[in-house]
Structure formats: C-alpha cells, structure tokens
C-alpha cells in the first residue's frame, strides 16, 4: 500500500469513468487510472480508503488501467483517487473523481411554470417535487451546458431560470439526493421550447436521448447553481 | 448467480496451519477477482488477501509471509494457505467475488465484492 511521502515527485495520474459517472443503481461502472507507460502499479482509493490495485504485464505498452465496478451501489459512490508508481516514486494524486449513484428509493415530479414553451426573455422556474424527505434537489440539462444546478429542500425545491434565452432551450430532469453521492430515480423529462427572436429556436434538441449514460456535466456547487467545480465533475479530471 | 461455499476451518493451536478452501458455482469463475475476508468477534471484517484473474496477489500486512492465497480456475477453487496461525487469527473467514471483472485488477475493499460466502470459523487457541 502507498506510503505518503514529501518526495511525490511524478506527474499526477488523470482518472475518469465510463459510461458516466452517474451510475444506475446495479449497474456497472468502468474507473479508468491514465499515468505513465513505466508504470509498474496502479493504486486506486475510495473515501480514502484503499480500494484496488493493478500491476500491468511489462509485455503490454499500457499507459493506463481499468477497475471494474461490476454492481453500483450506495456503498461504491463517492470520491475515488487514484496513484501510479514508476520505479521507487509514487505520482501525485490524481484529481478527484466523484462517483453518484442513481435509481434509489423515489421518482421526483419535475414542471416548470408558466409553461414548456415559452417566450424568449420570459421568466421560467422549474419545480422539483419528491414525496420522500431529501436535503438536496439536482437539475440536469440533458446534452446542453454541461451543467447541472442544486437546490436545498425538504420535499420540493425551485430552479429560477430568469428571463430565458435560446441557451436554456432543451430536456432537463431533477434528482433528489439522500447524500451528495446518493440520488433517486430521475423525474420524467420536460423539455423546454423557446419561440420567438431572431431565428426560429423551438425545436427541441436533436438527438434526445432518455439514458443517462450520455449525460456529461459539471456539478455547481453553491445553492445558485452558478459556480462550477469542472475538476471535480468531469468525466476526465486532469487540470 | 454466483454461489459461493467456504470449506477447511477449524481448531487449530498457535503455530499451526490450515488450508481453507472456497468452491465457486457457475462458468464466470476464470472472469472473477477472488479475495478472503476475516471478522473477529466484536470487531468489523477485514481484508486478508486477494487474487486477480492473472493469479497476481495482495495480501494484508498482518498475514504478509504466513498466508497464501491461491485458485484453481479448473476446479472454481480459490484457497488460502494459513500457516504460523496466531491467536488474533481467530475469525469467521468470508471468501468474496467481484464478478466479472476484467484485466489484472487485484480488489482490497469490500464494497468491490459483489459476492459473498457464508464463512468458515477459523478458531486459534492452546
């Protein structure tokens, strides 16, 4: 097992997940370690704990290793690191990676007011409604800015769009969280349409797709949903 | 479905080995990490070793030189070799699969084993 030192003097590993990293519930996750090709070991952790380990045949020129989730449940979400060592150095720790797991207990109600399609510059919230006590509400724009929002509450929660542009145009979901790693099932898709401008934007996105397989995104992490945290939340974190 | 049935526990005194064994139902065998597990009375379950599907091992510090893990890919066998048995080996040792699994990935932490034995009680005393 690793042994922390001062003398880390490798480059940092980059660490990422495929298909994504929001897993269904049962379903299997691929978590892949990139470091260098003389690396004789890989070290994966979760929670800080250490979780797997590979040594790659010195036969195959491979510059990166795959652990394989085979069931995601509550107990494998969360944050995974990974190391590498190359002769007697260890790398620095790879950037985090953040592992949510989807599909528990409940299907919260997503709507949004006044309507699904709207004007441009028109006021738009969205409203995100899970029967089940949760502390936490996450909204999802599926293929669009790469950006998910969350919101405090109980049993509801409100996304104020504000005046709306073509950028918000698109199919969303929401997700309650039992812990930051821990979400529902997702709501049922809306898709918001906005007509009028310059050109005619109210169609919905092409390519729609409902698996949450093709969803990339940061995570913001202040309760505006503004501020993204992209080395925490992308699919490859190396910055 | 993966079953899992732990064999070879036992009394034992200090010094002294056993051989315990894990018998594998089913054809994914070849395709599966296989680790041991301990759990000592009050205490939480431990890792002891494990084995990827390339026979590479790992093995806890605290076991490091006195147990052997091993399998059997033509049996569906995976076995630990105790040998200079302590006391605070005294446990229920739980084999454990992660299957399928691909590469050479050797897994420490129980949350990657998606399955499990019923255990075998392993008791070392004079």
């Known amino acids: 097992q690793r042994i922390n030192t001062e003398k880390e003097t490798l480059p940092k590993p980059i660490i990422w997940a495929k298909p994504s990293i929001m897993v269904t519930n049962g379903n299997s996750v691929n978590i892949w370690c990139q470091g260098a090709q003389s690396a004789s070991e890989y070290q994966l952790y979760f929670e800080g704990s250490f979780f797997a380990l590979e040594r790659p045949k010195p036969s195959r020129s491979m510059n990166k290793v795959r652990f394989f989730i085979s069931q995601m449940t509550s107990h494998t979400a969360g944050i995974y690191t990974c190391f590498y060592q190359s002769g007697e150095l260890w790398s620095k720790s790879s950037n985090p990676l953040k592992l949510v797991v989807t599909g528990l207990y409940d299907t919260p109600n997503l709507w949004v007011y006044p309507r699904p399609e709207v004007t441009l510059g028109e006021n738009v919230t969205f409203f995100c409604q899970l029967k089940t006590a949760t502390s936490k509400f996450f909204l999802l724009k599926e293929r669009g800015s790469n950006h998910i929002q969350n919101k405090y509450g109980n049993i509801q929660a409100e996304f104020p769009m504000g005046p709306v542009t073509r950028a918000h145009r698109g199919t969303y979901r929401c997700f309650g969280s039992y812990n930051d790693y821990a979400w529902s099932f997702p709501s049922e898709p809306v898709t918001l349409l906005i007509t009028g401008g310059v050109e005619n934007s109210s169609l919905a996105p092409t390519d729609p797709t409902s698996s949450l397989d093709y969803w990339e995104f940061d995570l913001s992490t202040n309760e505006s949903g503004l501020q993204k945290d992209s080395a925490f939340w992308d699919h490859t974190t190396q910055n | 479905e993966v079953q899992l049935v732990e064999s070879g526990g036992g009394e034992v005194q200090p010094g002294g080995s056993l051989r315990l064994s894990c018998a594998a139902s089913?054809?994914?065998?070849?395709?599966?990490?296989m680790g041991w597990f301990r759990q000592a009375p009050g205490k939480e379950r431990e890792f002891v070793a494990a084995?990827?599907?390339?026979?590479?091992?790992y093995y806890a510090e605290s076991v490091k030189g006195r147990f052997t893990i091993s399998r059997d890919n033509a049996k569906n066998t995976v076995y630990l070799q105790m040998s200079s048995l302590r006391a605070e080996d005294t446990a229920v040792y739980y084999c454990?699969?992660?299957?399928?699994?691909?590469?050479?990935?050797?897994?420490?932490?129980?949350?990657?084993?998606?399955?499990w034995g019923q255990g075998t009680l392993v008791t070392v005393k004079p």
């Open positions: 084995i990827s599907r390339s026979d590479d091992t």
């Open positions: 454990a699969a992660v299957v399928p699994t691909y590469g050479n990935a050797i897994y420490v932490h129980s949350a990657a084993y998606n399955y």
């Open positions: 089913g054809r994914t065998f070849a395709s599966a990490a």
